[in-house]
Amino acid sequence: EEELQVIQPDKSVLVAAGETATLRCTATSLIPVGPIQWFRGAGPGRELIYNQKEGHFPRVTTVSDLTKRENMDFSIRIGNITPADAGTYYCVKFRKGSPDDVEFKSGAGTELSVRAKPSAPVVSGPAARATPQHTVSFTCESHGFSPRDITLKWFKNGNELSDFQTNVDPVGESVSYSIHSTAKVVLTREDVHSQVICEVAHVTLQGDPLRGTANLSETIRVPPTLEVTQQPVRAENQVNVTCQVRKFYPQRLQLTWLENGNVSRTETASTVTENKDGTYNWMSWLLVNVSAHRDDVKLTCQVEHDGQPAVSKSHDLKVSAHPKEQGSNTAAENTGSNERNIY
């Protein structure tokens, strides 16, 4: 009888993560007497996957009925494959012996490659908000995919970005890989409603890429513009002074009125109006009793927006002026801010 040969017909097998891998092996002879074992890898550090002789291998089942001696099919199935299972598997025939069984003949090996989907991309922006015209960095990460080939694209509101750098790690062979990309985005005042999208395409996704998004509303700060105006009111001795706070984001805003440098009133933006671009407008007013003043009054509207240093706008109120002739009525946007009379 010819000497036993161990035949592994498949040089490579490709399996999707979570599925079952079938590793084929047949022997050409019933002798010598001794067990078949499966290993991942070769050499002294090889990992035992299945031993016909003994042991518990819950993920492994034999393809054929190994309780029949005439069966020479030693193929196995490994269930619930993960990227960590990738490697070269060897079917090895041992000869019964002591103190240990003696390796008699090995198959040529079957390389198991595992296709694993990338995790959902996670996009993160800068820790602190930035203002329009500034360039901010966004990162995108996805993990656990195999094989290594992967495509990553960045978009802002559907428009593809070009200023980004991408790395896939590790550089060498690995059971699975990770991708990390950093994109640079220039902010504009209109970006409150904008989105940055990271799109990952991989062979396991069958043409349906994964996307991660970041809303620029989390990143941008649009500072307000201030305008202080004086308008007449019905009472001859009263003047209405308004502070228009326009086009700001986010909403967190505190306004302080100063009269000749002294704090008169502080209020927090509450009833704001939202613009189409996502920014906000707000208005505050003061009712000033002109007859109570001998000299001109310097009124200052001071705004602290989103914890930033205060900005202010001043208005000189001439006590000798005729209230009805000054300013223009731009109070239409007012939705009930506080009134204050000065005596």
């Epitope: 019933l30 007497v33 078949i36 029949k68 001696r69 019964k96 069984d101």
Partner: antibody
Framework: EVQLVESGGGLVQPGGSLRLSCAAS????????MHWVRQATGKGLEWVSA???????YYTGSVKGRFTISRENAKNSLYLQMNSLRAADTAVYYC????????????WGQGTMVTVSS | DIQMTQSPSSLSASVGDRVTITCRAS??????LAWFQQKPGKAPKSLIY???SLHSGVPSKFSGSGSGTDFTLTISSLQPEDFATYYC?????????FGQGTKLEIK
């Protein structure tokens, strides 16, 4: 059902010959290592002979040159030709199947009695 | 040849007892050790192979352990049908050899 049935035992004079047969059913005998084991009355078990799947044969020292193990695949049968019999060969002879991969005995026949006496 | 030595040669025990029989090989036999049960006038029955693996249909009250040269057979709770003679056997190399047997009797 997997079964082994021995036959051919009996009374024989010292120096005589006997041929034991073992008919296998429920499996292909040629795919397994097959054995003969004997047991003298009131004594322990003694392995006698084996034949491998490739036709290789093995014997215990006391029967070497006197006993011959063989098989006939067409009849799915195992044989033990015993020549130059001695009183010490008196025993029940069992036909035994070796295990699937390690040759561990798994199936035993019911045994056949061989008596060597004048 | 490899010598197999069983101890004790005989053992008296009661129903429900846990008993252990030992078997020693004269040289390392890996774990190619089998245990058999034989009742008077009957053919032996295979219980255990490769020191600890139970043959099909053998109740789990039988267990085997050991490797190299020292082996044990344990019966966890003796029943009347377990009183018999038990043999160990090495089958790592020819000639295969048996222990002399341990006769388990009712006390």
């Amino acid at each position: 059902e997997v079964q082994l049935v021995e036959s051919g035992g009996g009374l024989v004079q010292p120096g005589g010959s006997l041929r034991l047969s073992c008919a296998a059913s429920g499996f292909t005998l040629s795919s397994y290592d097959m054995h003969w084991v004997r047991q003298a009355t009131g004594k322990g078990l003694e392995w006698v002979s084996a034949i491998g799947t490739a036709g290789d044969t093995y014997y215990t020292g006391s029967v070497k040159g006197r006993f011959t193990i063989s098989r006939e695949n067409a009849k799915n049968s195992l044989y033990l030709q015993m020549n130059s019999l001695r009183a010490a060969d008196t025993a029940v002879y069992y036909c035994v199947r070796g295990g699937v991969w390690d040759d561990a005995f798994d199936i035993w026949g019911q045994g056949t009695m061989v008596t060597v006496s004048s | 040849d490899i010598q197999m030595t069983q101890s004790p040669s005989s053992l008296s025990a009661s129903v429900g007892d846990r008993v252990t029989i030992t078997c020693r090989a004269s040289q390392d036999i890996n774990n190619y050790l089998a245990w058999f049960q034989q009742k008077p006038g009957k053919a032996p029955k295979s219980l255990i192979y490769t020191a600890s693996s139970l043959h099909s249909g053998v109740p789990s009250k039988f267990s085997g352990s050991g490797s190299g040269t020292d082996f044990t057979l344990t019966i966890s709770s003796l029943q009347p049908e377990d009183f018999a003679t038990y043999y160990c056997q090495q089958y790592v190399s020819y000639p295969y050899t048996f222990g002399q047997g341990t006769k388990l009797e009712i006390k």
